[in-house]
Amino acid sequence: MGSRRGPWPLVWAVLQLGWWPGWLLDSPDRPWSPLTFSPAQLTVQEGENATFTCSLADIPDSFVLNWYRLSPRNQTDKLAAFQEDRIEPGRDRRFRVTRLPNGRDFHMSIVAARLNDSGIYLCGAIYLPPNTQINESPRAELSVTERTLEPPTQSPSPPPRLSGQLQGLVIGVTSVLVGVLLLLLLTWVLAAVFPRATRGACVCGSEDEPLKEGPDAAPVFTLDYGELDFQWREKTPEPPAPCAPEQTEYATIVFPGRPASPGRRASASSLQGAQPPSPEDGPGLWPP
């Protein structure tokens, strides 16, 4: 109860906040190691994983490795950390740190990257007391681009087997759509004949619960009625309308995993690993 705990909780709080007073920066006595953070520029499509590597030139005895994003005001926002052989996930579990077997390299991954994850990232090593110090890596830039769903005709001529698959897919989709349209027509007729039966219930989709794809699940394709002309173009989903008793129902057709066709990316969660840096930054840390 009355035991004195000293100033360490305060110091630790300062370190965890991600801003550092000048007197913490350069203590001459404490061992430290240069850090790299690569690739210098990484581009992934939304939904893919983005992975950086934070590397230490040498393994100091006691250190904390933090992963930061630079805010628009040049403040460092801590995303996740590694401390004394354990990972400390941040508030957002999409940001993951993994220590590699050599002990000096750390994979820092954003799972299912979003457009607003684009920005500047870095890692920082904090060398623990006595003489606490900070050591920052170079910055790296992440660009998350919108998913591009090209028309099959624009892709380089695929092998015959793939075009056969695509033809089968189109025929299958068409037949399913026709069936569903007939079903909808039947539903509409029934609704017209028995209007009271359709008024009571209303199913509202949650904006926070999109179609999830588990790590082992087959990729899931969704197709909405705006795509009936089979032009595989990107659609920006409209926000869900407020739930009303007389709400018109729209169906979403869900196809269980099929092989990826040239005009469509198969899975949003394919690991986008170490991209080579841009040519201007030379070979850097990335083997061919």
Epitope: S55, A57, D58, I59, E280, P283
Partner: antibody, heavy 115, light 108 residues
Amino acid sequence: EVQLVESGGDLVKPGGSLRLSCLASGFTFSNFHMNWVRQAPGKGLQWVAFVNVGGIRTAYADGVKGRFTISRDDAKNTLYLQMDSLRADDTAVYYCARAFPGDYWGQGTLVTVSS
Amino acid sequence: SYVLSQPPSATVTLRQTARLTCGGDSIGRKSVEWYQQKPGQPPVLIIFGDSSRPSGIPERFSGANSGNTATLTISGALAEDEADYYCQVWDSSTKAWVFGEGTQLTVL
């Protein structure tokens, strides 16, 4: 194309001073740690000084501590090495190089310390 | 201060395998870089992070690092591989980059 070009090498008397410069181009200079490395005639490579990204941290080889100062000007894409109290054994070709990893090096500039 | 030990010279027959060593106390905990230097030229990075090759470096060059020894292997050495080879690490306790003394490789 990535290029590092050293300049400032010269013949200087013992006890004199010299300032070496290294102009970087073809890459984002501010995003890389930098080294000065030297090589005496017919000898091996010897690391001289290191500066990290942002210029906050510097490190020096034992033989040059207190005499040499490394610095960088990211606005000018230039790395510097200020050499004071020069000695005969500082005679060498001085290279600037990106550090960790040392994937690009300049062609070097010759510093000769002799009376 | 931290010391890296390299044999002063090594010889390999054309198209045979050369193994160059770099010894240091617990070097396995450190990230090793290897450089090739030919007369009158600056050094060229051939291995970084123990075993990674920068783009443009032939596949015959490979690296490994564990315990107290780092190794550079040249599989099927060519005449153009005749050069001096240096290993380098960062020593966090002395806060210094350290080079080995270098190994002069001769290809017969």
